[in-house]
Amino acid sequence: TPEVWVQVRMEATELSSFTIRCGFLGSGSISLVTVSWGGPNGAGGTTLAVLHPERGIRQWAPARQARWETQSSISLILEGSGASSPCANTTFCCKFASFPEGSWEACGSLPPSSDPGLSA
């Protein structure tokens, strides 16, 4: 069964800046990745970025840089200032859509005890 992993990290240099990394563990080819915060995209979450392997990347503030790391993993850097910036207990979700298998999603947040720069 395919799985999705999510890793959230606070940048040591900018304490209100976050990096979210997500990956898909499965055999299907990825058609679309959606990153959201505040919960899954279908349950009140707000879309931060949508990554398509052919048609490119769309991102919305406070997302600063979304990119593919591999064919089955992505990373997203969030801007750390402004009213819409994330806080330490924000939940981030990644949804990987693979055709014709379907979609798999997972969520993660920064562990309360983690120091800046450590992986979640």
Partner: antibody, heavy 120, light 107 residues
């Protein structure tokens, strides 16, 4: 303008074969996942077969596995459904449809359909 | 397979009425739900995708809502051209499955 035009339907005896075609135009055919959906007279919609834009990953309805084959010819902008060992219960209107990644794989464009009647 | 149960299976209404069709999934399908309209002898047409997004050219009287397992298609003020059969569909997990359809008829 996106257009999908099916052909190849007709009357065939049980155990016989048919090859359905779907001519696509108005979009980059190679970039989209495609499907065949059927509708028996007075009944609902049923996904029969689907093929990923990479032409590798496919899906088949359990009752047609081993009998039907979905394929496409990028050079001809055409989708095909080879149907062998046809049964009475395969009688239906067959539609080809395009899937849009950005719409959660919803089928955004459909052909007009072609009627397949399996009867002796 | 994920089952999509639509209700009602048929519905009689008048022009100007507000109509609601519901669809219940046998397990969570995230937001991967679409609604289609089909008229006799014609192919289905996409109305709504991702639960609540109207497809190009779809009038604003059509709206979708819901999350998880329960979804709704609402037509705020029925027009003569809206009398048709409506299908919900999930595209969360293969195989994509459809509801059995709701036939909307003129009262």
């Amino acid at each position: 303008e996106v257009q999908l035009v099916e052909s190849g339907g007709g009357l065939v005896q049980p155990g016989g074969s048919l090859r359905l075609s779907c001519a696509a135009s108005g979009f980059t055919f190679s970039s989209y996942h495609m499907s065949w959906v059927r509708q028996a007279p007075g009944k609902g919609l049923e996904l029969v077969a689907a093929i990923n834009s990479n032409d590798i990953n496919t899906y088949y309805l359990d009752t047609v596995k081993g009998r039907f084959t979905i394929s496409r010819d990028i050079a001809k902008n055409s989708l095909y459904l080879q149907m062998n060992s046809l049964r009475a219960e395969d009688t239906a209107v067959y539609y080809c449809a395009r899937h849009e990644d950005y719409y959660g794989f919803a089928m955004d464009y459909w052909g007009q359909g072609t009627l397949v009647t399996v009867s002796s | 397979d994920i089952q999509m149960t639509q209700s009602p299976s048929s519905l009689s209404a008048s022009v100007g009425d507000r109509v609601t069709i519901t669809c219940k999934a046998s397990q969570s399908v995230s937001n991967d739900v679409a609604w289609y309209q089909q008229k006799p002898g014609k192919a289905p047409k996409l109305l709504i995708y991702y639960v609540s997004n109207r497809f190009t050219g779809v009038p604003s009287r059509f709206s979708g809502s819901g999350s998880g397992t329960d979804f709704t298609l609402t037509i705020s003020s029925l027009q003569p051209e809206d009398f048709a059969t409506y299908f919900c569909q999930q595209a969360y997990r293969s195989p994509w499955t459809f509801g059995q359809g709701t036939k909307l008829e003129i009262k």
